[in-house]
Interface confidence: low
């Protein structure tokens, strides 16, 4: 599969920054999502978790952008082996954790 360019990762990071900075009410009405293992396959795992949140316009662009980094089709209810067993967190916390990790990847030049 083609390697995602640094610009795509930068845009994803910028979108996550926008979400965290513009958050007024609880993000996605406080919806809970599965926590994921951030060490490998982070894009698909993040999408598999966030795709189960519906009706939340604030993260729709993030969901769409993550689709661009995940080479396989991801459907709601699909659970990755990278999911942290039986641990759910709020979408807001999930986004913050993902943002910190993606910033680290960007600094290290890991765009795939």
């Amino acid at each position: 599969s083609p390697v995602p360019p640094s610009t795509a990762l930068k845009e994803l990071i910028e979108e996550l920054v926008n979400i965290t900075q513009n958050q007024k009410a609880p993000l996605c009405n406080g919806s809970m999502v599965w926590s994921i293992n951030l060490t490998a396959g982070v894009y698909c795992a993040a999408l598999e978790s966030l795709i189960n949140v519906s009706g939340c316009s604030a993260i729709e662009k993030t969901q769409r952008m993550l689709n661009g980094f995940c080479p396989h089709k991801v459907s709601a209810g699909q659970f990755s082996s990278l999911r942290v067993r039986d641990t759910k967190i709020e979408v807001a916390q999930f986004v913050k954790d993902l943002l910190v990790h993606l910033k680290k990847l960007f600094r290290e030049g890991q765009f795939n």
């Epitope: 390697v3 360019p5 795509a8 952008m65 689709n67 661009g68 980094f69 080479p71 089709k73």
Partner: antibody, heavy 123, light 106 residues
Framework: EVQLLESGGGLVQPGGSLRLSCAAS????????GSWVRQAPGKGLEWVSA????????YYADSVKGRFTISRDNSKNTLYLQMNSLRAEDTAVYYC????????????????WGQGTTVTVSS | SYELTQPPSVSVSPGQTASITCSGD??????SFWFQQKPGQSPVLVIY???KRPSGIPERFSGSNSGDTATLTISGTQAMDEADYYC?????????FGTGTKVTVL
């Protein structure tokens, strides 16, 4: 406004060559994937070739492999299709297409199309 | 090579529902896309990722995809929906378009 403008079509004899160009405006082509899709007179759509948004990978339909070459000039914000050894069956309207937002071009829809340029291969 | 098969034509009365099918081996495991093309015009994306509508596409267009079949549904069909419709999927480093369906609004 995002727009694609194709040029370079025309009448060519069998065995001849043509180079199609697709100038993009309203966005930077280098950040996106691009495809060429053709449609023979009265027929359906046929995908021809794609250039990945991650800058390098190229893909071709079996019907044109070895004869057509897709390329991109980022400085000119333009996508190209070099067509060699043309055959009568290559006669079609050729559309330039922007492939969505993703670096993996196969995950996004072909959401911006040019108006098409006509290629006629005939003696 | 991978093939996507559509019915050549579908007829529908104004205000009724038109359903167009697209069949391919394990198509449900892939993303499906749908395009509308009116005579003399370039195709327009109406559904991506099986069931999502791009901005500007009316809500009457919806899609689904499971098993071997993707379906485009036009609810409350209008005269302006008369066009050719093509499904599309990605398989083994190539895009594949369906054979196309002409929708006629009676």
């Amino acid at each position: 406004e995002v727009q694609l403008l194709e040029s370079g079509g025309g009448l060519v004899q069998p065995g001849g060559s043509l180079r199609l160009s697709c100038a993009a405006s309203g966005f930077t082509f280098s950040s996106y994937a691009g495809s060429w899709v053709r449609q023979a007179p009265g027929k359906g759509l046929e995908w021809v070739s794609a250039f990945s948004g991650s800058g390098g990978s190229t893909y071709y339909a079996d019907s044109v492999k070895g004869r057509f070459t897709i390329s991109r000039d980022n400085s000119k914000n333009t996508l190209y299709l070099q067509m060699n050894s043309l055959r009568a069956e290559d006669t079609a309207v050729y559309y330039c297409v922007q492939d969505g937002l993703g670096p993996y071009f196969y995950n996004y829809g072909m959401d911006v199309w040019g108006q098409g340029t006509t290629v006629t291969v005939s003696s | 090579s991978y093939e996507l098969t559509q019915p050549p034509s579908v007829s529908v009365s104004p205000g009724q529902t038109a359903s167009i099918t697209c069949s391919g081996d394990k198509l449900g495991d892939k993303y499906s896309f749908w395009f509308q093309q009116k005579p003399g015009q370039s195709p327009v994306l109406v559904i991506y990722h099986d069931s999502k509508r791009p901005s500007g596409i009316p809500e009457r267009f919806s899609g689904s995809n499971s098993g071997d079949t993707a379906t485009l549904t036009i609810s409350g069909t209008q005269a302006m929906d008369e066009a050719d419709y093509y499904c599309q999927a990605w398989d083994s480093s190539t895009y594949v378009f369906g054979t196309g369906t002409k929708v006629t609004v009676l």
